[in-house]
Interface confidence: low
């Protein structure tokens, strides 16, 4: 029996890419490239966790370039199988020898783009309730090995208060962790810097986030409140709008009051601060009121809480559903208009 020299194949598995959003599509293709071997019979077998898979190998195609041949075989997997941590192997038998390459879903190294955010206290908590808190938010964690740790510190080295932690599973099966730290009103106003340090076994290094009082120019908000006119078909409901503009910095709290009572935040919808054409910021706030409310007392107050507002960090404007009644009242209380 004469033995002849042959060039053994190189076996490499390639994997189809994720979709545009970085998620796995419903099916994943694995491509086994068997390249650079002396032409001859080869057998390709796919294994799942070491077990031979019953797959159609008719898709395997062979090409020859010069003296060497290449073959490729494709395996289509469901997303479920790919995500289930199984190992897939392309096993090639050639000239009595076995060559193989294996692959599996990579561990989420970050995990999967974990992000951390640190908020400043709301002006309402800071100036009205006088119990400010800051929140460290960690999103997009896998519910996997090792707990995420959030630790607080102060740039001054002074001790921090006791924080409260909350963990929430999102619809997409990721984990969101928040840690809320009470801070001293005076410490915050005097410019203390607070740091949140996030550690997790899957993170290549700790994430650090810090927050402090915003520096830069200050400007008090201007507040304007309006009532929309009656609309056909909605006589028992009205929308009140409040424009708050030209304030700096952007931290602001908006409240609506009726009968001297603050309405729940869920009652109104307020935009995030947006930059004006100048150097300040503006927000819009929208409140729906019912006939029962305005017939009880037709005065609603839009209040902005902002550090530059004086004397008590608040600016407010009253608005009525039927402003013509206000005109009569004002005229009746003042001098006769003639």
């Amino acid at each position: 029996v004469c033995s002849r020299d042959f060039t053994p194949p190189t076996v490499k598995i390639l994997q189809s890419s994720c979709d545009g959003g970085g998620h796995f599509p419903p099916t994943i293709q694995l491509l086994c490239l068997v390249s650079g071997y002396t032409p001859g019979t080869i057998n390709i077998t796919w294994l799942e966790d070491g077990q031979v898979m019953d797959v159609d190998l008719s898709t395997a195609s062979t090409t020859q370039e010069g003296e060497l041949a290449s073959t490729q075989s494709e395996l289509t997997l469901s997303q479920k199988h790919w995500l289930s941590d199984r190992t897939y192997t392309c096993q090639v038998t050639y000239q009595g020898h076995t060559f193989e390459d294996s692959t599996k879903k990579c561990a989420d190294s970050n995990p999967r783009g974990v992000s951390a955010y640190l908020s400043r206290p709301s002006p309402f908590d800071l100036f009205i309730r006088k119990s400010p808190t800051i929140t460290c938010l960690v999103v997009d964690l896998a519910p996997s090995k090792g707990t995420v740790n959030l630790t607080w510190s102060r740039a001054s080295g002074k001790p921090v208060n006791h924080s409260t932690r909350k963990e929430e599973k999102q619809r997409n099966g990721t984990l969101t962790v928040t840690s809320t730290l009470p801070v001293g009103t005076r410490d915050w106003i005097e410019g203390e810097t607070y740091q949140c340090r996030v550690t997790h076994p899957h993170l290549p290094r700790a994430l650090m986030r810090s927050t402090t009082k915003t520096s830069g120019p200050r400007a008090a908000p201007e507040v304007y409140a309006f009532a929309t006119p009656e609309w056909p078909g909605s006589r028992d409901k009205r929308t009140l709008a409040c424009l708050i503009q030209n304030f700096m910095p952007e931290d602001i709290s908006v409240q609506w009051l009726h009968n001297e009572v603050q309405l729940p935040d869920a009652r109104h919808s307020t935009t995030q601060p947006r930059k004006t054409k100048g150097s300040g910021f503006f927000v819009f706030s929208r409140l729906e009121v019912t006939r029962a409310e305005w017939e009880q007392k037709d005065e609603f107050i839009c209040r902005a809480v902002h550090e530059a507002a004086s004397p008590s960090q608040t600016v407010q404007r009253a608005v009525s559903v039927n402003p013509e009644l206000d005109v009569c009242v004002e005229e009746a209380e003042g001098e006769a208009p003639w």
Partner: antibody, heavy 119, light 111 residues
Amino acid sequence: QVQLVQSGAEVKKPGSSVKVSCKASGYTFNGYWMHWVRQAPGQGLEWIGYINPTTGHTEYNQKFKDKATITADESTNTAYMELSSLRSEDTAVYYCARQEYRHSWFAYWGQGTLVTVSS
Amino acid sequence: DIQLTQSPSSLSASVGDRVTITCRASQSVDYDGDTYMNWYQQKPGKAPKLLIYAASNLDSGVPSRFSGSGSGTDFTLTISSLQPEDFATYYCQQTNEDPWTFGQGTKVEIK
């Protein structure tokens, strides 16, 4: 391969408690949420709640908040659900099911554990 | 809670028939571009088995005669040509909002 193997059937007296186990194998136990679902005789499926085995964090269907307690033991790759103050209405098959990471469906289920409450 | 109403509750069909089961949600189960609706098959004495996830994706190993469609509040599970092994109870499930809920089930029986 992924397997969820539950403890055997139980017969319990009203007022007592029972602890059902679900042993996971073939995957990284603490990389996935473990849920529990119940099915009363001849009835449909009801979601009870879940646990994150890593942190022990649990969420419950309000209906079962005072009935079920879900725990997990990472060292043995086992999830547990304890049912307290048993009543005849708690007679059902209880399933554990694994939720896929970043997805909201149950691809793998335990075989089910029948809990019968009878005096 | 989101209520899921399946119809019909039961149906009799023959091998080779095309079978359609609908599931209506009391509110939308779409969120941020994804649809949180799944379908399961359950045979007596067995655990449920995933058939369709995210409204229209066929789970691996599930025959292509099964298909799912829909978005928002209205969903359909279709079996294009009923086979003897398909006689079972089918459940829809929403996972858009806690508590996750299931439909009451549709029993497919032999005519």
